[in-house]
């Protein structure tokens, strides 16, 4: 038994690090293998993480930490009962993929205007809180051209957008991540998708406006 | 519960010996780091010996290095401390105290035990 | 070794006032500091550690903050059951960790 593709982890930087590999052939990861890992200078006893199977020769493993701080390092050794197969380091500082926002919400009480709200995934004593920038998808459920991606670069979770930018009486869904310019990060997951009906149509005059000034094209 | 019980307190001449022990009770003991923390009388703390859990790994600050040892035996759920060529600033209460799952802080500690050095 | 310096070395203060303790090292140490709590005659009782984190148990009027160099703890509103000395650690490297000289908080 041996190891095809190291181990290689990220962190949500929060509570948990999920450590991927994958090995030389089918592999029973929950009963063959072990995922020992320890905070380097920690005196109590490594931590055990059993590896969940990922396809048939792949491996991955959730291992619970303690909040994060930027300085820490682990160790991290893969056995396979008494056999040491791969022995590594991980900084969870320097791997850091962000969890995914939450509770996206399209709000389209105002006629005119779309506003979408979602939650930080972190809690305010987290370092990330207020270190988050964000992307929001876009999509039309009847038309894959109609694609768009909107750069959230404050820290406010949420997004207006005119109702007009979209077209009228057909539906849409969203989505938004997050990452982190500060760690680096890579984008999180994408939130579960909202799905809502574009329902604008133009005043009267404004439509009326637009069409005679159309028209003199 | 976690419970750490400290003994082998007492008094003690300038140059002797001593023996401190800590059963340790309600948790893991063998998955747990250990230490003594001492305080000197109307003194602050100071950390005198660290093991680590399976005993692999001591420590000590310059003031203890070569004159005192920390122990365990994990069998018996037990720390110790041999404390040789004892001083009179070796004064002080004497608690053992777990480290933290997670962290090197201590979360639990004992009620204490008195070491006095004086002729 | 890290030399941790708390201030104030004592505090007057009365039930309900907000108390600030500071604790500052000589170093860098990140987030690996602990705060304890000890009463006359009575161990060490364990409440923040990671600088921030309060150990199970610990009511919410204590909070933890600061990180690389300058930390804090901070009792919001003291209630008589506080009134004790209080002592910062750090837990950053190998272990020669060391406490602060310890703060006491009395009664005005």
């Known amino acids: 038994m041996k190891v095809l593709q190291e181990p290689t982890c990220v962190s949500d930087y929060m509570s948990i690090s999920t450590c991927e590999w994958k090995m030389n052939g089918p592999t029973n990861c929950s009963t063959e293998l072990r995922l020992l890992y320890q905070l380097v200078f920690l005196l109590s006893e490594a931590h055990t993480c059993i590896p969940e199977n990922n396809g048939g020769a792949g491996c991955v493993c959730h291992l619970l930490m303690d909040d994060v701080v930027s300085a820490d390092n682990y160790t991290l050794d893969l056995w396979a009962g008494q056999q040491l197969l791969w022995k590594g380091s991980f900084k969870p500082s320097e791997h850091v993929k962000p969890r995914a926002p939450g509770n996206l919400t399209v709000h389209t009480n105002v006629s005119d205007t779309l506003l979408l709200t979602w939650s930080n995934p972190y809690p305010p004593d987290n370092y990330l809180y207020n270190h988050l920038t964000y992307a929001v998808n876009i999509w039309s459920e009847n038309d894959p051209a109609d694609f768009r991606i909107y750069n959230v670069t404050y820290l406010e979770p949420s997004l207006r957008i005119a109702a007009s930018t979209l077209k009228s009486g057909i539906s849409y869904r969203a989505r938004v991540r997050a990452w982190a310019q500060c760690y680096n990060t890579t984008w999180s997951e994408w939130s579960p998708s909202t799905k809502w009906h574009n329902s604008y149509r133009e005043p009267f005059e404004q439509h009326h406006h637009h069409h005679h000034h159309h028209h003199h094209h | 519960e976690v419970q750490l019980v400290e003994s082998g307190g007492g008094l003690v001449q300038p140059g002797g010996s001593l023996r401190l022990s800590c059963a340790a009770s309600?948790?893991?003991?063998?998955?747990?780091?250990m230490s003594w923390v001492r305080q000197a009388p109307g003194k602050g703390l100071v950390l005198v010996a660290t093991?680590?859990?399976?005993?692999?790994?001591?420590s000590y600050p310059d003031s203890v290095k070569g004159r005192f040892t920390i122990s365990r035996d994990n069998a018996k759920n037990t720390l110790y401390l041999q404390m040789n060529s004892l001083r009179a600033e070796d004064t002080a209460v004497y608690y053992c105290a777990r480290f933290f799952r997670f962290r090197n802080a201590m979360d639990y500690w004992g009620q204490g035990t008195l070491v006095t050095v004086s002729s | 070794d890290i030399q941790m310096t708390q201030s104030p070395s004592s505090l007057s203060a009365s039930v309900g006032d907000r108390v600030t303790i500071t604790c500052r090292t000589s170093e860098n140490i990140y987030s690996y500091l602990a705060w304890y709590q000890q009463k006359p005659g009575k161990a060490p009782k364990f409440l923040v550690y990671n600088a921030k984190t309060l150990a199970e148990g610990v009511p919410s009027r204590f909070s933890g903050s600061g990180s690389g160099t300058d930390f804090t703890l901070t009792i919001s509103s003291l209630q008589p059951e506080d009134f004790a000395t209080y002592y910062c650690?750090?837990?950053?490297?190998?272990?020669?960790?060391?406490f602060g000289q310890g703060t006491k908080v009395e009664i005005k």
């Open positions: 093991i680590n859990s399976n005993g692999g790994s001591t």
């Open positions: 309600g948790f893991t003991f063998s998955t747990y780091g």
């Open positions: 650690q750090h837990y950053y490297g190998p272990p020669t960790w060391t």
